[in-house]
Amino acid sequence: GSMGHAPKVGRLIYTAGGYFRQSLSYLEAYNPSDGTWLDLADLQVPRSGLAGCVVGGLLYAVGGRNNSPDGNTDSSALDCYNPMTNQWSPCAPMSVPRNRIGVGVIDGHIYAVGGSHGCIHHNSVERYEPERDEWHLVAPMLTRRIGVGVAVLNRLLYAVGGFDGTNRLNSAECYYPERNEWRMITAMNTIRSGAGVCVLHNCIYAAGGYDGQDQLNSVERYDVETETWTFVAPMKHRRSALGITVHQGRIYVLGGYDGHTFLDSVECYDPDTDTWSEVTRMTSGRSGVGVAVTME
């Protein structure tokens, strides 16, 4: 990536890291308003299976692993990217390495959920306070989950699907910060590990993933009022280990693995028409990216 100053524009979709033949250090940003990609400052250490989020206008890259010809190291790292300076800086590491992690943000705090360290599949969850640069463990999930999808809705943290070390999962659970407890919610219709999970219009969407046999293109959404999962239109491509985010009322899915190919495809879902469309391609195919959108 280039080390020049990034243009000071809002509402970019950032994609960090990923995997193609080895873990990647790319940071790139897509501008949906004009369809352009920006090449930004590389991660200091390549990583895949990471998660991305934005707090206070800063982009955070959380966990993952560096799978390279020199070895394979799971990451406990938290790194912060400032779009105004186009620079990364390290923050306090998590208590344990977490590859194929999920993250969510509540009240400016980052929740790191599940993931793996070697063959240990975590059910542990920890919360980061940016003002203090500190991590603290909170209540563990009821289920060990890697490749878990995480989303926040109405100040509740949802952990969806994943892999517990033996089985891919259709189960989902919800964390109540005030009570510091997890409760199971209605299971998805489909087993999904490595799905893309996000929130749009008061629903939690789970897109794609892997069911233990095949990559999926199906998409379902959870209505918190009715506590039911309902299928919506499928994506054009089957994909697991995809990136996902929401931008101006639409869902964007980025890359992933279809069982044969590392996808460069970026699809966009319009809930008004219940349709997916191909909107752009990443500069190269990859899986296991961390994705987030800058705030206004």
Epitope: G49, N72, C119, G165, T166, Y210, Q215, S240, G259
Partner: antibody, heavy 121, light 107 residues
Framework: EVQLVESGGGLVQPGGSLRLSCAAS????????IHWVRQAPGKGLEWVAS????????LYAKSVAGRFTISADTSKNTAYLQMNSLRAEDTAVYYC??????????????WGQGTLVTVSS | DIQMTQSPSSLSASVGDRVTITCRAS??????VAWYQQKPGKAPKLLIY???SLYSGVPSRFSGSRSGTDFTLTISSLQPEDFATYYC?????????FGQGTKVEIK
Amino acid sequence: EVQLVESGGGLVQPGGSLRLSCAASGFAISASSIHWVRQAPGKGLEWVASIDPETGETLYAKSVAGRFTISADTSKNTAYLQMNSLRAEDTAVYYCARRTASDGRAAMDYWGQGTLVTVSS
Amino acid sequence: DIQMTQSPSSLSASVGDRVTITCRASQSVSSAVAWYQQKPGKAPKLLIYSASSLYSGVPSRFSGSRSGTDFTLTISSLQPEDFATYYCQQSYSFPSTFGQGTKVEIK
């Protein structure tokens, strides 16, 4: 019945290349992580490479990293090991094996019969 | 890399004997250890996974146990078909590593 059948071994000169195939039947390779393990003549077992069916990520032993490439074609239900820049010390019987869960607690429950690779001038 | 030190490298035993093979990991590997049996010219066969779980179809005379970083394969009453080489394997951390093998021969 679950079966793995390797092919593609043979005699090759140092610096040469070979592509090994592992044809699976009785199960879908898309549902398993596939591993290659080798055994030099009269020696023990050495893990070589693996591919994860969910993420597509591959792992390699340091001794082969940068020279060997593992891949899978789910439409043919076959895994491959492309071996380049071969050395005398790569001489071994190469086995493919499946692991039904991709975590470390699972083990390799089915193995192929092996294919012999000899690197010699 | 985690080293799996297997002992003995070979042993002689008679049919009906109780045989114990040990593998010591150079660091913690939890219970992520498997045991395999290999006969000359053949592929390895899985006996034990997760340190102590007997794989389907394997005779109950085979058992595995763990004590810290020490792992043991026991054959309670050796049968003629058990004369072979046995390997332990750790899959706790990358890269997966095998013990050097124990050859069980007829006394």
